[in-house]
Interface confidence: medium
């Protein structure tokens, strides 16, 4: 009931709580002397459902039969209307429409850890829309029954707050949940289980790893578990991997030897536990242990390449380059590289440890036969040395690969192709494709890149350290024993017209012709490999088309003669540069007047 109901009553039959689809009778009746003054026949009783008028009647009472009420709560209010006055609230009632509880389904219980508490969950079924009380009962050995009630609106979980003990792990427990509301009750099917069925061990803790004699092959994982644990499963993986290695162990008693770990690798380890071979469930995975395995001496051999540069009649510069070992080959932190240089006939040798670099440059006599050996060392030892005999890599003309071409292949890739050398192609033991950014000064500090290709290959895709709009000098070497032949080409992965033209820095007169000198276009403005320069000239103040001379681009060329100018005529000259994508804008303009005699 709502409000004070001083003036009258609202009664509901059969009940304030009804089953969905039922009919209710609502009666509103006035108490004595609570009607309208003067004429009681003027009493007009009105029944509202929420704010909507559903019935009215003149007199002291009103009866209304109501059907089709929705699930939930519906409010009915009775009001009195008298002539020349506002409606007066008499009384009201709430009617609760719902359903009897369905049978709770899938009752299951779990105890987290040997010291945890028993908690059960179930599925309530459809909402009753009424206050429904759930009672969970657990019957166990020694004729004991625990009972807990739940007063939440949506109750599907209860924790007894008690701890089952493993005195008789095979003893049976039976759980049952009963739902009760005003319209009925329903009990779940009983769920019968043993201690071993429902206890889910706590995850293992205090995980440690030990490497005996700092060796990856003698590794033991240790952990702590609850007392009754029989089974463990271990999973481990390199930290950068998504795939786990799994191991199942029985009666491990908190330790297990791992035999297949890789050296110098960070691993993640986790462990889970179970109390019984067939019964119960696995614990959650433990917190991860992350640990790095010890180093082992490097395997594999360094990939070594070199460059020779003529200094003078008696000396040459040797630059050695090598690539880092892969992580799996290095098997540790490379502390230094050992380079040994030896003159093969005289037996003179020098050894040097290089740290922090993967290159080494020295000057040696041009005479004698020289060899180098390079190896990588970590804390456990050194890799096998890579030995190379220093030779003139381009000396054997007949070994030079033919028809070398370089074409752009997608973003930041260049496809290099060639034909085998004229000399017996079967003599080739391997090809080496080398590339470096083209710098007009032939700068030896520019990083060198290379890859090796099998003797039956006639193409290679180069992608390492390739940038768009940069020109690369590409060489293909054919190696055969202690001989080598090479061919070179320029190539770029992406090009466009140069951003500027060459800057003319001088024009000089020589025997009736002129020599034009210019500064190279800065590398970052070349926008790829230059193919040609163009020199333009025309008479000053003339509207005629300029004449031009096109010069094939050569890296070292910075001047060119022109002999078709008329004496004592002032000319304007400028230059442009071209890539395969087009021509640059003009460089600077210079005026010049040839002083020589007229013909």
């Amino acid at each position: 009931k709502i409000d004070a109901c001083k003036r009258g009553d609202v009664t509901v039959k059969p009940s304030h709580v009804i089953l969905l689809g039922s009919t209710v009778n609502i009666t509103c009746s006035l108490k004595p002397r609570q009607g309208c003054f003067h004429y009681s026949r003027r009493n007009k009783l009105i029944l509202y459902k929420f704010d909507r008028r559903i019935n009215f009647h003149h007199g002291h009472s009103l009866n209304s039969q109501v059907t089709g009420l929705p699930l939930g709560t519906t409010l009915f209010v009775c009001k009195l209307a008298c002539i020349n006055s506002d409606e007066i609230q008499i009384c009201g009632a709430e009617i609760f429409v719902g359903v009897a509880p369905e049978q709770p389904q899938n009752l299951s219980c779990i105890q987290k850890g040997e010291q945890g508490t028993v908690a059960c969950t179930w599925e309530r079924g459809r909402d009753t829309h009424l206050y429904t009380e759930y009672t969970l009962q657990l019957s166990g050995p020694k004729n004991l029954t625990w009972q807990k009630q739940c007063k939440d609106i949506y109750c599907d979980y209860l924790d007894f707050g008690i701890n089952l003990t493993p005195e008789s792990p095979e003893s049976n427990f039976t759980a049952k949940v009963t739902a009760v509301n005003s319209l009925g009750s329903s009990s779940s099917l009983p769920s019968t289980f043993t201690f071993l069925d429902i206890v889910r061990p706590l995850p293992p803790w205090d995980i440690r790893i030990k490497f005996q004699k700092a060796s990856v092959s003698r590794c033991t994982l240790y952990w702590r578990d609850e007392g009754l644990v029989l089974l463990n499963r271990l999973r481990y993986r390199p930290s950068n991997s998504r795939l786990w290695n799994m191991v199942n162990v029985t009666k491990a008693k908190g330790r297990h030897d791992l035999l297949d770990l890789k050296p110098f690798t960070e691993y993640e380890f986790q462990i889970s536990s179970k109390l019984h071979l067939y019964k119960g469930s696995w614990s959650d995975w433990s917190e991860s242990l992350r640990a790095q395995t010890p180093e082992e001496e490097p395997t594999g051999m360094l990939d070594v390449w070199y460059m020779k540069r003529h200094i003078d009649y008696s000396r040459q510069q040797i630059s050695l380059f090598w690539k880092n070992l892969s992580v799996s080959e290095a098997r540790g932190k490379i502390l230094h590289y050992q380079v040994t240089l030896q003159e093969l006939t005289g037996g003179k040798a020098m050894t040097q440890n290089i740290t922090g670099h993967t290159s080494w440059t020295t000057v040696i006599p041009r005479t004698g036969n020289w060899a180098v050996a390079v190896s990588a060392a970590n804390s456990k030892g050194s890799s096998l040395p890579t030995r190379i005999n220093i030779m003139n890599l381009c000396e054997a003309g007949l070994l030079a690969p033919r028809q070398v071409s370089a074409n752009s292949e997608g973003m930041d890739n260049i496809l290099v192709t060639w034909q085998p050398p004229r000399k017996d192609p079967s003599a080739v033991q391997e090809y080496v494709v080398e590339w470096r950014e083209l710098h007009p000064g032939g700068d030896t500090q520019v990083p060198l890149n290379w890859l090796r290709s099998r003797p039956y290959n006639v193409s290679a895709l180069i992608s390492e350290n390739i940038k768009s709009y940069i020109c690369y000098e590409i060489r293909v070497y054919a190696l055969s024993g202690d001989q080598g032949g090479c061919s070179s080409i320029l190539g770029n992965s992406k090009h466009k017209a140069p951003l500027s033209g060459p800057h003319i820095n001088a024009i000089t007169e020589e025997k009736g012709s002129i020599l034009i000198s210019w500064n190279s276009i800065p590398v970052q403005e070349q926008m790829g490999c230059l193919l040609h320069y163009r020199i333009y000239w025309k008479e000053r103040d003339s509207n005629s088309q300029p004449q031009l001379c096109e010069i094939p681009y050569r890296v070292s060329q910075n001047s060119h003669p022109i002999n078709s100018l008329q004496p004592r005529v002032t000319y304007v000259l400028w230059m442009t540069a071209l890539t395969a994508a087009g021509e640059s804008s003009h460089g600077n303009e210079r005026e010049f007047c040839l002083q020589g005699k007229a013909n």
Partner: nanobody
């Protein structure tokens, strides 16, 4: 130190009812599980019923289930045992006990004497046939 005093025992006919009370003092009552045990002459002390700290979990021995109801009033520091349909075999000295507090690593079923730290002096219940 918790002191427990039982009351409400007496002589009753078979089929009758009694309500035992146990008043606690000297501790934080709401932090203890409370239990009832009984001991008949010449027999071991036997667990009867218990109620957990919050009052919504109860446990009964099967022989009294449906006849006895354990309840508590934390505001009054009192635990009750309502005994209906009493039988001659229910006759015994009834003891009230306060269980040791739950910690993160210690839970209990509260059905064994060793789960309880404090005990009352007992109250006699006699059932005549």
């Amino acid at each position: 130190e918790v002191q427990l005093v039982e009351s409400g025992g007496g002589l009753v006919q078979a089929g009758g009812s009694l309500k035992l009370s146990c008043a606690a003092s000297g501790g934080t009552f709401s932090s203890y599980a409370m239990g009832w045990f009984r001991q008949a002459p010449g027999k071991e002390r036997e667990f009867v019923a218990a109620i957990m700290r919050s009052g919504d979990t109860t446990v009964y021995v099967d022989s009294v289930k449906g006849r006895f109801t354990v309840s508590r009033d934390n505001a009054k520091n009192t635990v009750y045992l309502q005994m209906n349909s009493l039988k001659p075999e229910d006759a015994a000295v009834y003891y009230c006990a306060a269980g040791r507090p739950v910690t993160r690593t210690y839970y209990s079923t509260y059905t064994y004497p060793h789960d309880y730290d404090y005990w009352g002096q007992g109250t006699q219940v006699t059932v005549s046939s």
